[in-house]
């Protein structure tokens, strides 16, 4: 057992080294480890094959370090890994697209507060078991096409607190099991009419605190299971172009936030849902 760590065998073989001031992944981690806790240290780099010997590893925590680089092969051989927490590593900024390849059993991936500026092509390829994906509080500006395509079992996708400016047509392709999509506190000004086409099981959609002045109801049509919708804190323009959204909200059986109008001036602060159809005039 490495000097700064505590190792024990029950109920899972565990190597626990949190908050020890470690500057590197310690050598001598027992190969039988099923759980490795390395959070709260000063580790800046995860070299290739750091945990290759740990074939039985199911939980790996590296959150709250100072990670600036993770080698593409850092997690090679971890076919049984279920939970990987890399959050709170603000200097990370980017992750090689091959980093998570081979993690076919992974069900929870924490990448929040990592300073991520982009999601490289194929970053989440093959993560068929993933259920929870934490990407909030990064610096993401775009959602590339098919980024999440392989995540057919994903139920929770947290993308809030980024700098995303639009939701393109293929951004959420393949997310057939998604239950919660949190996109609040971004800069979203445009949602493609087919952006939510695969989200037939979505129950919660947060779009509040964005830059939306309009939302095509065609985008909302596929959301058959939607129960909770938040659209507040957007610069909604309540003219004739808002009529389709107004009509959709009248029919919506679930629970929704207020949709306060920004323009025209005479309707500023009024809730779109509570307006009459003939209030929505002038284009």
């Amino acid at each position: 057992c490495p000097g700064a760590c505590v190792c024990y065998n029950e109920p899972k073989v565990t190597t626990s080294c949190p908050q020890q001031g470690l500057q590197a992944v310690p050598v001598g981690i027992p190969a039988a480890s099923q759980r490795i806790f390395l959070h709260g240290n000063r580790i800046s780099h995860v070299p290739a094959a750091s945990f290759r010997a740990c074939r039985n590893l199911t939980i790996l925590w590296l959150h709250s370090n100072v990670l600036a680089r993770i080698d593409a092969a850092a997690f090679t051989g971890l076919a049984l890994l279920e939970q990987l927490d890399l959050s709170d590593n603000a200097q990370l900024r980017s992750v090689d697209p091959a980093t998570f390849h081979g993690l076919g059993r992974l069900h929870t991936l924490h990448l929040d507060r990592c300073g991520l500026q982009e999601l490289g092509p194929g970053l989440f390829r093959g993560l068929a078991a993933l259920q929870y994906l934490y990407l909030q509080d990064n610096a993401l500006q775009a959602l590339p096409d098919d980024t999440f395509r392989d995540l057919g079992n994903l139920t929770h996708l947290f993308l809030h607190g980024n700098r995303i400016s639009s939701v393109p047509e293929r951004a959420f392709r393949g997310l057939h099991s998604l239950d919660r999509l949190l996109l609040h506190q971004n800069r979203v000004a445009h949602v493609h009419p087919h952006a939510f086409r695969d989200l037939g099981r979505l129950m919660t959609l947060y779009l509040f605190a964005n830059n939306l002045s309009a939302l095509p109801t065609e985008a909302l049509a596929p959301l058959r299971a939607l129960q909770y919708l938040r659209l507040n804190d957007n610069p909604w323009v309540c003219d004739c172009r808002a009529r389709p959204l107004w009509a959709w909200l009248q029919k919506f059986r679930g629970s929704s936030s207020e949709v306060p109008c920004s323009l025209p001036q005479r309707l500023a602060g009024r809730d779109l849902k509570r307006l009459a159809a003939n209030d929505l005039q002038g284009c």
Epitope: Y8, S16, F37, H110, D179, L182, H184, T204, Y228
Partner: antibody, heavy 119, light 107 residues
Framework: EVQLVESGAEVKKPGASVKVSCKVS????????MHWVRQAPGNGLEWMGG????????KHAQKFQGRVTMTEDTSTDTAYMELSSLRSEDTAVYYC????????????WGKGTLVTVSS | YVLTQPPSVSEAPGQRVTISCSGG??????VNWYQQLPGKAPTLLIY???VLTSGVSARFSGSRSATSASLAISGLQSEDEADYYC???????????FGGGTQLTVL
Amino acid sequence: EVQLVESGAEVKKPGASVKVSCKVSGDTLAELTMHWVRQAPGNGLEWMGGYDPESGETKHAQKFQGRVTMTEDTSTDTAYMELSSLRSEDTAVYYCAADRRHWGSLDVWGKGTLVTVSS
Amino acid sequence: YVLTQPPSVSEAPGQRVTISCSGGNVGSSSVNWYQQLPGKAPTLLIYYDTVLTSGVSARFSGSRSATSASLAISGLQSEDEADYYCAIWDDSLNAWVFGGGTQLTVL
């Protein structure tokens, strides 16, 4: 900082129902996994039920099956627990508690709501 | 209670005390420890058997054996007087199971 703020104390008659609310602030309810735990006067903690991330369903302790309803309104960041057919032994402090990181621990707790059942 | 804890323990200030948790499915489950100060809500101290919650004093520590878990508190202080509960998520019951609680008195 995440806080769970519960509704005020309630006094109920036997046979009645009570609905306790739990409002999330500093975070959104959709990010949390919510549970309910109660504590009768002078007794220990007793889990009533909560969201099971693996199945995506709300699970209840066998003891409360059919009497408890747990709901969430993520549009207002409020969770609710309703207990029906109240009896005197349901007198307790009712806590909402949440798992913030999907780590399998109840790491945020409300201050609790005292429910008194008395005729 | 399915999980067994000593009902009470007491020790002098500055000393070390250990609270055990056994029974039920402790042998195959990860244990969490909660502290409940008088008149307050519980707070999480330790999860995954040994991992200390952020902000909790390093005087608290968790340990494991094949059939039980233990919470140790060293350098006892008067503000440690509280009830301490162990808990597991029991996969067979699909439920959180709590121990009966241990009342710690600092003499």
